[in-house]
């Protein structure tokens, strides 16, 4: 893959190591901790990036949500196994032998079990709520600029086309973004939601994962957008399987 | 081999409504963007608007909208791109062309349709 | 809509001759930037998409180059059969895509 032309680096993502080693002379990225080639012209893949970011591992903890099928990752930090596409592989395991089912976006969806654990298939998130609370300003942002703005901003930045943008809810300070993927609604290069959600709450915790780009710079009719928390909802095709002494 | 093949050439009166067919085959068509392009003669390309097959989600260039209309048969695999209350400066060369999600590239093109308007 | 601007507009050159046509966006379209060669009566044809990837199956003797606002088509050694009509076409925003006004390469 070509990257940046002229210096050999990664635009979408800085954990890479490059070098003009590619077909040509041309320049090649590889991710840190897993050595595979990415596209450097779009996202990378969630697994991907939690494999790279790899260095001090935290333990994964998912709650299941209000709504009785979200699950909610909070910051869950492992070391994951990623397929040859670089998704997620639907069983992950520890080094101690302790095993659990995830979705598509890496969130743990089952109870922990051992290596006997079965995960049939890798299940597709395929409705992401992104629930932001935004610092005090002057006043209200006007809902139809919000709602184009955060559209461009997720198809400019993050590549992700505005069809799978479902809606734009804001009640101030809260705004909800949706995003929406089939399986089948995907085509060609377009790039999944897990990946452009990961991102932006990358973004907006300040940890950019773009190359040499500046932080996220979120303005509304010039009114810059601020946000103080973030939550993030993961709703699955198949609802998640846990035990009811998790419920409880 | 992929392939696009358009419908023939049409003259229509002012007023009228135009339907351009253009069938894929050579590849799945659910998986990719079609896009339409038209070419005025002797003029550049003008994008109209674009549709994907697998669940018939469309957008057009607010230039066309309430005049486009595109549309998908999944079943023969073929795209449909109907265009209404035709003027004379809608005379032009109408293409579908397959695109990438990503980069918004038309890998693959059909021959083009020429759509004359004339009274 | 951002515009995009090719120069010039046509241009003459001999077989052999090494040529660069131009391309400008109103704004900034990091690398979404795409070729396409177009002769009379013919479908357009995509040669270079994302700045610089090269199409399979086009020669190697066309290039691009560029990021942002300024992006350039290099051919380095024209052949016969590289007389034609020549687009930029950004990918970067939301829809509508837009064209150049095309550069017509024409025999000296």
């Known amino acids: 893959h070509t990257a940046a032309q002229d210096n050999c680096t990664c635009p979408t993502n800085k954990m890479t190591v490059c070098s003009p080693d590619g077909p040509g002379g041309r320049c090649q990225c590889r991710a840190l901790g897993s050595g595979m080639a990415v596209d450097c012209s779009t996202l990378t893949s969630k697994c991907l990036l939690l494999k790279a970011r790899m260095s001090a591992p935290k333990n994964a903890r998912t709650l299941v949500r209000p709504s009785e099928h979200a699950l909610v990752d909070n910051d869950g930090l492992y070391d994951p196994d990623c397929d040859p596409e670089g998704r997620f592989k639907a069983r992950q395991c520890n080094q101690t032998s302790v095993c659990w089912c995830v979705n598509s976006v890496g969130v743990r969806r089952t109870d922990k079990g051992d290596l006997s654990l079965r995960c049939d298939e890798l299940v597709r998130t395929h409705h992401i709520l992104i629930d932001l609370r935004h610092r005090p300003t002057a006043g209200a942002f006007n809902h139809s600029d919000l709602d184009a703005e955060l559209r461009r901003l997720f198809r400019e930045r993050y590549r992700l086309h505005p069809k799978f943008v479902a809606a734009v809810h804001y009640e101030q300070p809260t705004i909800q973004i949706e995003l929406r993927q089939n399986t089948s609604q995907k085509a060609a290069g377009d790039v999944d939601i897990g990946d452009a959600a990961y991102y932006f709450e990358r973004d907006i915790k300040g940890e950019s994962l773009f190359q040499g780009r500046g932080g996220l710079d979120l303005r509304v009719r010039g009114e810059p957008l601020q946000v103080e928390r973030t939550l993030i909802y993961y709703l699955d095709e198949i609802p998640p399987k846990f035990s009811m002494k998790r419920l409880t | 081999q992929v392939q696009l093949v358009q419908s023939g050439a049409e003259v229509k009166k002012p007023g009228a409504s135009v339907k351009v067919s253009c069938k894929a085959s050579?590849?799945?068509?659910?998986?990719?963007?079609m896009h339409w392009v038209r070419q005025a003669p002797g003029q550049g390309l003008e994008w109209m608007g674009e549709?994907?097959?697998?669940?018939?989600?469309?957008s057009y260039a607010q230039k066309f909208k309430g005049r486009v209309t595109i549309t998908r048969d999944t079943s023969t695999s073929t795209a449909y791109m109907e265009l209404s209350s035709l003027r004379s400066e809608d005379t032009a060369v109408y293409y579908c062309?397959?695109?990438?999600?990503?980069?918004?590239?038309?890998?693959?093109w059909g021959q083009g349709t020429l759509v004359t308007v004339s009274s | 809509d951002i515009q995009m601007t090719q120069s010039p507009s046509s241009l003459s050159a001999s077989v052999g001759d090494r040529v660069t046509i131009t391309c400008r966006a109103s704004?900034?379209?990091?690398?979404?930037l795409n070729w396409y060669q177009q002769k009379p009566g013919k479908a357009p044809k995509l040669l270079i998409y994302?700045?610089?990837r090269l199409e399979s199956g086009v020669p190697s003797r066309f290039s691009g180059s560029g990021s942002g606002t300024d992006f350039t088509l290099t051919i380095s050694s024209l052949q016969p059969e590289d007389f034609a009509t020549y687009f930029c076409?950004?990918?970067?925003?939301?829809?509508?895509?837009?064209f150049g006004q095309g550069t017509k390469l024409e025999i000296k």
């Open positions: 062309a397959r695109g990438h999600g990503n980069y918004v590239s038309f890998d693959y």
């Open positions: 549709i994907t097959p697998s669940d018939n989600y469309t």
């Open positions: 050579g590849y799945t068509f659910t998986s990719y963007w």
């Open positions: 076409q950004q990918g970067y925003t939301l829809p509508p895509y837009t």
């Open positions: 994302y700045t610089s």
């Open positions: 704004q900034d379209i990091s690398n979404y």
